[in-house]
């Protein structure tokens, strides 16, 4: 097996041949996130924007309620940055008092929920403490990987608490995906 | 409207193919910087390396006196990281002596100059308080993301402040970009 | 030359067409990992889960002994997200005691090893100070960017401290690679 | 302080050449794009065309494309502008702008007449 | 190339009133911006990408609309509001200007 490693794949002769330009990609940006229900231990969604400003979807990847629907299988590059912001977190002022804590922490998920499967599947996670000593702190978390995914696959972002995600800006928190 | 979005697209036929091997593309890498005069309330941009150790620009995209030069529309990916490095940050001093503060910050901000809008466009930022109580703090900042470019549009990497960056390694601070 | 600058390419009548299915692809996902010597001064390297779960390699990109091996010459994109974790930081405890103090990090380097060059190539790396004031703490480092690779080249993910990795999660921690 | 200063007043024959010049303060002109619009007698404004100074390209109102030429000079920060074959209705005011950098600015304006 | 038509031509009020000029587009553009113009003066940045005001703008002064359509408004009129205005689209090659809109006192 090892000698074939770098053996020519005559595969490609038969593979189907096709323009880049009608790819379904998509790049949503933060809006103002209005208070939804969410189910007790499961991290809220966030929704986008999806045509404004820097904001596209195209060649049918189309964005409905929270998700980007997956209009065909493939590899597809999944990206996404949160910003988050917060008052000082409780973390430091426990540690003045001199007693040690579970540090506060802030994470994003980007989750795929599929027909094939009846749980949601979680993709990519970038979780961090948050300790902060100074009065105001703000940072992102950014994620982007590569999955194969199937025609009619949703994605969505989820967040640990969406009282801290930072919408202000189209630049500071994003979600995106493309074939490739 | 829902019953068609994953109908087939019909305009692959028409579209044209092209060889992936001839798209625009480049990856940048840090230098030491000199310090230029900027514009006030408006971050300095880095200049690159683009042709040295893991460097290159090819296919006509070109980079010139900090910027990468779009030579042909379309849907790029565009990415940086930025290391940051710096003496305690004023923060935990001022934290130290009781008085509460507004915290020092590090950021980047991946920025579009485009004759379509007279403005400077923010692509993606990336921006992060700094309140470390360490005596010397590190820490990158990575952006990523997609975008539709038009020829002609120049692509810069500002940050928030030139004498904080990492310019010791080509692999800890770059700047690149590819047409998908 | 300038003026050639955004002049039509002819290259692309020449270059071969291929079908974007059949390129080498590979997602790897973190796997517990087992203490294994390494030289001093040298980053240990992660090995990784190939095949299940979110785990997959395609098109003759193979992983054997921690590093993926690259089938066929071409522009890369490579990214890798490292979980750390860990209890409080000596930084800390050595601040509260009031000696300044050099403070204790966290690093990722995506490496490559190639034929045609003795040393080992640091491609990609993302390192962070960590001076935590709470008693566990815990944050990723993502990066991401695009190589020139040739063929037969292997590439691997070195960190620091390979005790402090987050290997609990595949979608905390994972590495992967694609032709572009 | 940001500014643009154009050339001075110039006045041609039918069928001669003229060359603009806008000279940039305060601001790099490659961070830019520089443009040039001109207004006739009593009309409204009219796009030429604008020049990247980083890299040359040029985008051009077809109206102008075989008549003009916009060059830069990034070593004296400065930006021209040449129109050949010159004709009675070149007449006009014609303004140097940048755009892409804020705030967009204006030059003072170079007067060209045309006259036998 | 995309056509812009300003409305009215000339615009005749007084100070205090409220004034509404008009720009249609001959297709859709991304954005609109609008030009000041004195006697005598350079055209000077007056809105921007469609609804935001220049450095210096008082903000009796608002900009809307999308598509074909864009407004420029004056809440109430001073007398150094007296000027011709143009709009400019940035969307299509080449360049366009409306051709203009006087607004003078009555």
């Known amino acids: 097996l090892k000698g074939q490693e770098f053996a020519p794949s005559h595969q490609q002769v038969y593979a189907p041949l096709r323009a880049d330009g009608d790819k379904p990609r998509a790049h949503l940006t933060v809006v103002r996130q209005t208070p939804t229900q969410h189910f007790k231990n499961q991290f809220p969604a966030l929704h986008w924007e999806h045509e404004l400003g820097l904001a596209f979807t195209k060649n049918r990847m189309n964005y409905t309620n929270k998700f980007l629907l997956i209009p065909e299988s493939g590899d597809y590059f999944i990206y996404s940055q949160v910003t988050f912001r917060g008052m000082t977190s409780e973390c430091s002022e426990i540690r003045q008092a001199g007693r040690p804590n579970k540090p506060d922490s802030i994470t994003v998920v980007i989750t795929k929920v599929t027909d094939s499967y009846p749980e949601p599947t979680q993709l990519l996670m970038g979780t961090k403490s948050v300790c902060e000593v100074g009065s105001n702190w703000f940072q992102p978390i950014y994620l982007g990987a590569m999955f194969s995914l199937q025609e009619g696959d949703k994605l969505m972002v989820n967040v640990s608490d969406i009282s801290l995600v930072d919408y202000t800006k189209e630049d500071k928190t994003f979600f995106g995906a493309f074939l490739l | 409207l829902k019953g068609q979005e994953f109908a087939p697209s019909h305009q692959q036929v028409y579209a044209p193919l092209r060889a992936d091997g001839d798209k625009p593309r480049a990856h940048l890498t840090v230098v030491r910087q000199t310090p230029t005069q900027h514009f006030k309330n408006q971050f300095p941009a880095l200049h690159w390396e683009h042709e040295l150790g893991l460097a290159f620009t090819k296919n006509r995209m070109n980079y010139t006196n900090k910027f990468l030069l779009i030579p042909e529309s379309g849907d790029y990916f565009i990415y940086s990281q930025v290391t940051f490095r710096g003496m305690t940050s004023e923060c935990s001093e001022i934290r130290q002596a009781g008085r509460p503060n507004k915290p020092d910050s590090i950021t980047v901000v991946i920025t579009k100059v485009t004759d379509s809008y007279p403005e400077p466009t923010q692509l993606l930022m990336g921006t992060k308080s700094v309140c470390e109580v360490g005596s010397n703090w590190f820490q990158p900042i990575y952006l990523g993301a997609m975008f539709s470019l038009q020829e002609g549009d120049k692509l810069m990497v500002n940050v928030s402040d030139i004498s904080l960056v990492d310019y010791t390694k080509e692999d800890k601070t770059f700047f690149g970009a590819f047409l998908l | 030359l300038k003026g050639q600058e955004f002049a039509p390419s002819h290259q692309q009548v020449y270059a071969p067409l291929r079908a974007d299915g059949d390129k080498p692809r590979a997602h790897l996902t973190v796997v517990r990992q087992t203490p294994t010597q390494h030289f001093k001064n040298q980053f240990p390297a992660l090995h990784w889960e190939h095949e299940l779960g979110l785990a997959f390699t395609k098109n003759r990109m193979n992983y054997t002994n921690k590093f993926l091996l690259i089938p066929e010459s071409g522009d890369y994109f490579i990214y890798s997200q490292v979980t750390f974790r860990g209890m409080t930081s000596e930084c800390s405890e050595i601040r509260q005691a009031g000696r300044p103090n050099k403070p204790d990090s966290i690093t990722v380097v995506i490496t490559k090893v190639t034929d045609s060059y003795p040393e080992p190539t640091q491609l990609l790396m993302g390192t962070k100070s960590v001076c935590e004031v709470g008693s566990n703490w815990f944050q990723p480092i993502y990066l991401g960017a695009m190589f020139s690779l040739q063929e037969g080249d292997k590439l691997m993910v070195n960190v620091s401290d390979i005790s402090l990795v987050d290997y609990t999660k595949e979608d905390k921690t994972f590495f992967g690679a694609f032709l572009l | 302080q940001v500014q643009l200063v154009q050339s001075g007043a110039e006045v041609k024959k039918p069928g001669a050449s003229v060359k603009l010049s806008c000279k940039a303060s305060g601001f790099d002109i490659q961070d830019t794009y520089m443009h040039w619009v001109r207004q006739a007698p009593g009309q409204g404004l009219e796009w030429m065309g604008r020049?990247?100074?980083?890299?040359?390209?040029?985008k051009y109102d077809p109206k102008f494309q075989v008549r003009v030429t916009m060059t830069t000079d990034t070593s004296t920060s400065t930006v021209y502008m040449e129109l050949s074959s010159l004709r009675s209705e070149d007449t006009a005011v014609y303004y140097c702008s940048r755009s892409g950098g804020l705030p967009d600015v204006w030059g003072q304006g170079t007067t060209v007449t045309v006259s036998s | 190339e995309i056509v812009l038509t300003q409305s009215p031509g000339t615009l005749s009020l007084s100070p205090g009133e409220r004034a509404t000029l008009s720009c249609r587009a001959s297709s859709s553009v991304s954005y609109m911006y609008w030009y000041q113009q004195k006697p005598g003066q350079a055209p000077r940045p007056w809105i921007y990408?469609?609804?935001n005001l220049a450095s210096g703008v008082p903000d009796r002064f608002s900009g809307s609309g999308s598509g074909t359509d864009y407004t420029l408004t004056i809440s109430r009129l001073e007398p150094e509001d007296f000027a011709v205005y143009y709009c400019?689209?940035?969307?299509?090659?080449?360049?366009?200007f409306g051709g203009g809109t006087k607004l003078e006192i009555k």
């Open positions: 990408a469609t609804s």
């Open positions: 020049i990247d100074p980083a890299s040359g390209h040029t």
């Open positions: 400019q689209q940035w969307s299509g090659n080449p360049r366009t």
